[in-house]
């Protein structure tokens, strides 16, 4: 049982990219407000987004404390203007979220090619090491800091005049590939966590091509 004239939240969904994590739910409130609570399996509940009319709550600050923990959230519904009101069981109406383990489930954000440099028939392609909101010792960690060797990048590269995409892979943020002299190449990268079964791959980075500003060419 729950409070009179309130509707329980439903379709509770975690939306998370590079650990920026938001809980979303329905319905849009009519004469009601919501409060969210989050906890680890073994921890205490912590309240967030008090008495909000939003249907989302940013829980990043909580989950980044330990991205390998499994979290559960719940959304409480209260009558607008009467948030102390409870049902006959003495507890407001609420709905539980699915469990969420950030390390295993956060989506990988679209990567960016930071630079590429050609030296003769070799090209060094560097992927930007994106900063996350995960902190250690008061500094924000990069995606590589968090995932280590669990994170790899796949580079797709092709001659501007051709359609076939060659691939290279790295568990750092740099590729060193062989290219044909005098040919212009284009590049795109994808972040991958091979050990996952879901949310394994990011979307592709924007394509960068030689002859554009980002690159540098040196004849050796």
């Amino acid at each position: 049982s729950g409070t009179t004239n309130t509707v329980a939240a439903y379709n509770l969904t975690w939306k998370s990219t590079n650990f920026k994590t938001i809980l979303e739910w329905e319905p849009k409130p009519v004469n009601q407000v919501y409060t969210v609570q989050i906890s680890t399996k073994s921890g205490d509940w912590k309240s967030k987004c008090f008495y909000t009319t939003d249907t989302e709550c940013d829980l990043t600050d909580e989950i980044v404390k330990d991205v390998k923990q499994t979290y559960l959230a719940r959304v409480f519904s209260y009558p607008a203007g009467n948030v102390e009101s409870t049902g006959s069981a003495g507890e407001p109406l609420y709905e539980n979220s699915p469990e969420f383990t950030p390390y295993l489930e956060t989506n990988l954000g679209q990567p960016t090619i930071q630079s590429f440099e050609q030296v003769g028939t070799k090209v060094n392609v560097t992927v930007e090491d994106e900063r996350t909101l995960v902190r250690r010792n008061n500094t924000f960690l990069s995606l590589r800091d968090v995932f280590g060797k669990d994170l790899i990048y796949t580079l797709y590269y092709w001659k501007s005049s051709s359609s076939g995409k060659k691939t290279a892979k790295t568990n750092t943020n740099e590729f060193l590939i062989d290219v044909d002299k005098g040919e212009n190449y284009c590049f795109s990268v994808q972040a991958v966590i091979p050990s996952r079964t879901v949310n394994r791959k990011s979307t592709d980075s924007p394509v960068e091509c030689m002859g554009q500003e980002k690159g540098e060419f040196r004849e050796i």
């Epitope: 691939t167 892979k169 994808q190 991958v192 079964t197 394994r200």
Partner: antibody, heavy 120, light 107 residues
């Protein structure tokens, strides 16, 4: 359970066409790379080409370039190998295989294979 | 393309023997080498990945190692079910290439 099942093989005349299918179950193909590998009777393994179903990117062995096309239908969780202008030397068992996209790029699951015979 | 030169092309051995198969890459492939086992009429099966890592479910008598561009598959004590053909494969760069295969036969 992860499974790849090839179909569509058979006897075809030189110059003819054939389309092979690779139906995946137990995983989503758009999260992986799918390769085609062939093996002529009594011979070794020869890589044919790959597709990344998440973006449609492909690459082919020189021996099939311009004649073979790999595609994927993510709604059917199936990859395809369209083979045109077939030659006697294309006679082989054709396998599809899953690449988990690790740094070493190993193929962790293979289909059972489908035999393509090109003969007049 | 990177060539993978595998040797020997065939060998005869007895149950309990230690068997070694080698593959030499024509250029640096880092550790991006896998080994597969294939039995007649069957698809290849992954044994070793990243040059030296045993794939899940593969018996511990199989092992892999790397020295520069030379890669070795070792079967420490050959079992009856190990008589098969073995292939190395590099996937350091596209196109991935296979060795010619080594057929392990009963002596």
């Amino acid at each position: 359970e992860v499974q790849l099942v090839e179909s569509g093989g058979g006897l075809v005349q030189p110059g003819g066409s054939l389309r092979l299918s690779c139906a995946a179950s137990g995983f989503t193909i758009s999260h992986y790379i799918i390769h085609w590998v062939r093996q002529a009777p009594g011979k070794g393994l020869e890589w044919v080409g790959y597709i990344d179903p998440s973006n449609g990117y492909t690459y082919y062995a020189d021996s099939v370039k311009g004649r073979f096309t790999i595609s994927a239908d993510t709604s059917k969780n199936t990859a395809y190998l369209q083979m045109n202008s077939l030659r006697a030397e294309d006679t082989a068992v054709y396998y599809c295989a899953r690449d988990i996209q690790s740094v070493s790029g190993e193929f962790d699951y293979w289909g059972q294979g489908t035999l393509v015979t090109v003969s007049s | 393309d990177i060539q993978m030169t595998q040797s020997p092309s065939s060998l005869s051995a007895s149950v309990g023997d230690r068997v070694t198969i080698t593959c030499r890459a024509s250029q640096d492939v880092n550790t991006a080498v896998a080994w597969y086992q294939q039995k007649p009429g069957k698809a290849p099966k992954l044994l070793i990945y990243s040059a030296s890592f045993l794939y899940s479910g593969v018996p511990s008598r199989f092992s892999g190692s790397r020295s520069g561009t030379d890669f070795t598959l070792t079967i420490s004590s050959l079992q009856p079910e190990d008589f098969a053909t073995y292939y190395c494969q590099q996937h350091y760069t596209t196109p991935p290439t296979f060795g010619q295969g080594t057929k392990v036969e009963i002596k």
